[in-house]
Amino acid sequence: MKRKERIARRLEGIENDTQPILLQSCTGLVTHRLLEEDTPRYMRASDPASPHIGRSNEEEETSDSSLEKQTRSKYCTETSGVHGDSPYGSGTMDTHSLESKAERIARYKAERRRQLAEKYGLTLDPEADSEYLSRYTKSRKEPDAVEKRGGKSDKQEESSRDASSLYPGTETMGLRTCAGESKDYALHVGDGSSDPEVLLNIENQRRGQELSATRQAHDLSPAAESSSTFSFSGRDSSFTEVPRSPKHAHSSSLQQAASRSPSFGDPQLSPEARPRCTSHSETPTVDDEEKVDERAKLSVAAKRLLFREMEKSFDEQNVPKRRSRNTAVEQRLRRLQDRS
C-alpha cells in the first residue's frame, strides 16, 4: 500500500478502532478531535502530569495520535545517520512517529506563552492552548502536509499557511491574571514590560464572561475572525511573541528585522485605547463598576485600536501592510467605535 494511502487510512480511523464511526469519513474532523485532546506540551514541568485524555503512558505509546503518525513521513528515505553513514541500517522502522512541524510550532508557542506568564506572574489557560493547537493544525491542508519531506509537495500551500488564519485573535486569551495581580502595565516607550499581550489579557480577565456572550451575539465566522487578525509582513506572528532581546528590536538588516518578532515597545496608545488597570485593593464604587462595564464593552475596540497603532508604526518602517479586513468586520468596528 502506498504511503499516502496508508496515512489517509490512518487519518480516517481505519487502522484505529478508537475513532468514532461518525468521524471516520471526515479527515479534518478526526484530526481536529485528536489535536484538541493532545494539548500543546510546553508547559511547566511541575504542572500536574495526569494525562487529561485518560490514557496511561503505555497506552499512549501504542496509540500515538494519528496526526503524529500521519506527519512522520518526513523524509524521502528513512535514514538516521548524518550522511547515511550509520552502521545501524534501516532494520527497524519506528512505529511511533516523531511530531509534525505544526504540532511543534504549537508547543513552542505554548512554551513561549508559559515563559511570558512566568515573567509577568500570570496564570495559563490550558483551554486556550488546546483551542490554539486544534485551530492551528486544522487550518493546514491535512493530506498535503503529510508528505513533509517526501519531495512531493515542496511548494508551500500559501492559502493554508496564511498567518492570520493560523493565529486567531482569540489566542490572546491564553494568559489570565492571578487574583492578586495588581501591577500597572501601562505602556511606556522602550519599557521592557510594555507588552500588548499582557495588557490585553489583564483586560480580558476583567471582562469575565461578557466577552463570550458578546462573541456569541456577534457570531463571528472563522473567516471574519481570522481576517481581523493582525499579521506582520506575512510572517507567522502572533501576539504571544515578544522581543526576546534588544538586538531583535534593533536589527541592522531589514531582512533580519522582518524575520524577527516585532518590537511592541514603540507605539504610544491614546488614553482611551490604553487598557487601564485598577488596583484590586480598591473598593469599587457604583461609578467604578460602570467604568469597568464600559471598558468591557470597549475592549474589542481597544484591541483593534492597539492593532491599528501597531500597523501605523510598522508602516513607518516600510514593512508591507497586511491585507485589509473584510467589510463585515470593518462595519462591526465602526459600530463599536461609534458606541465609544
Partner: antibody
Framework: EVQLQQSGAELVRPGASVKLSCTAS????????MHWVKQRPEQGLEWIGW????????EYASKFQDKATITADTSSNTAYLQFSSLTSEDTAVYYC???????WGQGTTLTVSS | DIVMTQAAPSIPVTPGQSVSISCRSS???????????LYWFLQRPGQSPQLLIY???NLASGVPDRFSGSGSATAFTLRISRVEAEDVGVYYC?????????FGAGTKLELK
Amino acid sequence: EVQLQQSGAELVRPGASVKLSCTASGFNIKDDHMHWVKQRPEQGLEWIGWIDPENGDTEYASKFQDKATITADTSSNTAYLQFSSLTSEDTAVYYCTTGEFDNWGQGTTLTVSS
Amino acid sequence: DIVMTQAAPSIPVTPGQSVSISCRSSKSLLHSNGNTYLYWFLQRPGQSPQLLIYRMSNLASGVPDRFSGSGSATAFTLRISRVEAEDVGVYYCMQHLEYPFSFGAGTKLELK
C-alpha cells in the same frame, strides 16, 4: 536522502564575527525547524536555539540570546548561525539539526584565537 | 532550567553483555498528554550525535531493537541488550519539554 551539509572550519580572532551555514538536501527546510547545538572540546552538548525557516521565527537559550543570531534562506535551503563579539569560550563544534533532532550536520569547528 | 544528570561518566562493558545507562531530570518530563519528552543520542568518536530514542521509549528509525528506553517522569534508562563494538561512544539524554532544551553530560560506553 536527507543531508545537512555544514560549512568548513573557521579560525577567527577574538571580538570578530562569524557566520556558519547549514545547507539541507533531500527536504525543504521550510517544512521543519532547524536547531543549532554547541559542543565544546571534550564536553557535552548545549542547545543554542531554533529557527522556523518558513517565517524566520526564532527562539534562543538565554545564554546565547545576545551572542547568537539564527537566520535562514529558503531559496538556498540554508540555515545560518551568526556569532558576534567572539571569545575563546565560543571555540567549539557547532551542529545544525532538524526539528526533532533526528538528522544532524557533520558539525563546523569554530576556533577563536589571537 | 531543567537539569539533566547522567551519574556515570563512563561504563566499561564486554561485547555481548547487556548494559543500562541512566539519566535523571530535575523536573518531571511527563506532559499531561501522556508523553514523556526525553530523548537519547549516541555520539560515536569523531561523529555527530545520532537520535536513538525519542519520547522516552520510542525507537528512532534505523536503530536496532537491541536499544530500548524506559523510565518514569524523572528517572530514565537506556538499555542495550547485547552490546556490539559499534555501540561504543558517548550517550546523551536530552529533555525536549521546556526551554532551554538541555542535555545530560553524557555517559561514555567503553569496551573492556
